[in-house]
């Protein structure tokens, strides 16, 4: 019985560890600045790193510019988006800007897209200053199903800060669905 | 066997609880306003509370102004930094301010410092208004190794809001590294 | 013994799953825009959805405009608050605004209210622009006891963005108290 108990304990420890790790998908994706679209209107950002620098992914998939959920659960989602302009980049077309981020969820089964979180600000970036900067942070707790996709839309993508510490989004699973 | 099973269950419950608690380091550190440096350029903030009011720490260490990781894992890191100015504090030299935060990771083994997250905004704090305020929030999910250190750098530290609900940073472990 | 072991494993799996779910209360509450108070001073927001769209709650209670903790623990709390104004809504009484959020904790046993987190910005919303927008995000890790209540106060509630992706707050339990 003692040996049996040890076996139970051992198998349990193994199972607990394994199931814990398997139960916790995550992703932290950083902007790939080699392929940022232009324009000032709302566009979807499709180029993100998932395996260099701070970027990483586990038990989720990154495909076609979207973060795909592989495992049902409740996830904490977050995004940090930085915009910047230096006078050496040339004059802005307008000093009145709308700098926004939208975190959207797309369901493939029922082709539909919904905004989970939005944030941002209207800004007046005057020519009196040589440098302008603004960051947005959003975060929230959402039920995600396997196959659902998370994507990021922003306004004024040409003003995005391309640093990995500046423009990123991510998710981590907190708990199962009951 | 029934007694043995109860013992297995008991020891498991104990082990599960213990390992769960041990596996979840956290910290929430609030600004110690008695020792804020001056300047408008980027400086490291080294004075934080870890054991009064909302401030707390467990299975992590606070030393020499840095939050030290004691346990490998994936952590959610966050910071909230508030800046404020009232006309009674004196006239601002420039109405054009760069209010920024940088959350940095330092590795002792390989002496190097890297910015994990940044946020902020350039602001125009006109003399027409008697009071100005601005807050930054950043957050993200990062792999941290034992011995690595997290620190906070800001611009214009003399404009920091010294309240514990205003200027703080923290971390909590979400999962082990595979 | 083998059957007994299977039973142990089975009961454990059941217990582990059950205890894990029970140990993880959460809430994500979205603004109920049918009942937003007026004024520009600090007011408590009492109307939130808890069971429609992205709004959800489990092992916590929403009552009298407050999120009530049912289970001791360390929780990550967050709020995202969006303010907006379009010229079609009429002229603003003042172009100098203080757009703020305060996340407060109330203890019933010791009748007292304390601010856990604050964020926001003073803004100059000039008549030169037809649309203005600004979002605040705050988040932090706090020890909460059963019976304690979380509520949201904002300035200028009449400027709140009523969308569920814009104005919301939430919490999820990360770990037990030792």
């Amino acid at each position: 019985i003692r040996a049996e108990k040890a076996m139970v304990d051992g198998s349990w420890l193994d199972l607990a560890k394994r199931s814990k790790l398997e139960a916790q998908p995550f992703a932290h994706l950083t902007i790939n600045a080699t392929d940022i679209p232009s324009g000032s209107h709302k566009v979807s950002l499709s180029s993100w790193y998932h395996d260099r620098g701070w970027a990483k992914i586990s038990n989720m998939t990154f495909s076609n510019g979207k973060l795909i959920v592989n495992q049902d659960g409740f996830y904490y989602l977050y995004a940090n988006i930085c915009f910047r302009h230096h006078e050496t980049s040339g004059d802005l077309a307008t000093e009145y800007l709308q700098l926004m981020v939208y975190v959207t969820k797309t369901s493939i089964k029922i082709p539909s897209s919904h905004t989970l979180m939005k944030g941002g600000s209207t800004k007046y970036w005057s020519g009196n200053s040589e440098f302008h900067f603004y960051s947005i942070n959003v975060g929230g707790f959402f039920k995600l199903r396997s196959g659902e996709e998370i994507s990021i839309e922003v306004s004024n993508p040409s003003l995005l800060d391309p640093d990995q510490d500046a423009t990123y989004f991510g998710a981590f699973k907190v708990r199962d669905i009951d | 066997i029934r007694a043995e099973k109860a013992m297995v269950d008991g020891s498991w419950l104990d082990l599960a609880k213990r390992s769960k608690l041990e596996a979840q380091p956290f910290a929430h550190l609030t600004i110690n306003a008695t020792d804020i440096p001056s300047g408008s350029h980027k400086v490291s903030l080294s004075s934080w509370y870890h054991d009064r009011g909302w401030a707390k720490i467990s299975n992590m260490t606070f030393s020499n102004g840095k939050l030290i990781v004691n346990q490998d894992g994936f952590y959610y890191l966050y910071a909230n930094i508030c800046f404020r100015h009232h006309e009674t504090s004196g006239d601002l030299a420039t109405e054009y301010l760069q209010l920024m935060v940088y959350v940095t990771k330092t590795s002792i083994k390989i002496p190097s410092s890297h910015t994990l997250m940044k946020g902020g905004s350039t602001k125009y704090w006109s003399g027409n208004s008697e009071f100005h305020f601005y807050s930054i929030n950043v957050g993200g999910f990062f792999k941290l190794r034992s011995g690595e250190e997290i620190s906070i750098e800001v611009s214009n530290p003399s404009l920091l809001d010294p309240d514990q609900d205003a200027t703080y940073f923290g971390a909590f472990k979400v999962r082990d590294i595979d | 013994i083998r059957a007994e072991k299977a039973m142990v494993d089975g009961s454990w799996l059941d217990l582990a799953k059950r205890s894990k779910l029970e140990a993880q209360p959460f809430a994500h509450l979205t603004i109920n825009a049918t009942d937003i108070p007026s004024g520009s001073h600090k007011v408590s927001l009492s109307s939130w959805y808890h069971d429609r769209g992205w709004a959800k709650i489990s092992n916590m209670t929403f009552s009298n405009g407050k999120l009530i903790v049912n289970q001791d623990g360390f929780y990550y709390l967050y709020a995202n608050i969006c303010f907006r104004h379009h010229e079609t809504s009429g002229d603003l009484a003042t172009e100098y605004l203080q757009l703020m959020v305060y996340v407060t904790k109330t203890s019933i046993k010791i009748p007292s209210s304390h601010t856990l987190m604050k964020g926001g910005s003073t803004k100059y919303w000039s008549g030169n622009s037809e649309f203005h927008f600004y979002s605040i995000n705050v988040g932090g890790f706090f020890k909460l006891r059963s019976g304690e209540e979380i509520s949201i106060e904002v300035s200028n509630p009449s400027l709140l963005d009523p969308d569920q992706d814009a104005t919301y707050f939430g919490a999820f339990k990360v770990r037990d108290i030792d």
Partner: nanobody, 126 residues
């Protein structure tokens, strides 16, 4: 990099006036606090006057009521109007631009300034 060029110095009799000008090379001059300092041979550089981006001013006690600092952001220029000049005002006058500290009161020292001009000589004869 901001280049600062002073002009307007010269020889003047006690009780007379001079107007110093300092032109900045950048249109973003408007986002810098500006100051005037002076130095006599063998001594430290002394604060004279400073002006915020919003044209709030501060003066050294020795020049209060006699000197006036002003700025014209459209012309990227800061001025120092010096009246009732005294022999002890004789010095090389330097223009400076900076944003290293947030408060005007800190600009009575030289460390908040990022950029300095080459200086212009002012001589007051008795």
């Amino acid at each position: 990099e901001v280049q600062l060029v002073e002009s307007g110095g010269g020889l003047v009799q006690a009780g007379g006036s001079l107007r110093l000008s300092c032109v900045a090379s950048k249109r973003t001059f408007a986002s810098y606090a500006m100051g005037w300092f002076r130095q006599v041979p063998g001594k430290e550089r002394d604060f004279v006057a400073a002006i915020t981006t919003g044209s709030i001013t501060i003066y050294a006690d020795s020049v209060k009521g006699r000197f006036a600092i002003s700025r014209d952001n459209a012309k990227n220029t800061v001025y120092l109007q010096m009246n009732s000049l005294k022999p002890e005002d004789t010095a090389v006058y330097y223009c400076a631009a900076g944003n290293r500290e947030p408060y005007l009161r800190q600009y009575t020292a030289s460390n908040p300034y990022d950029y300095w001009g080459q200086g212009t000589q002012v001589t007051v004869s008795s």
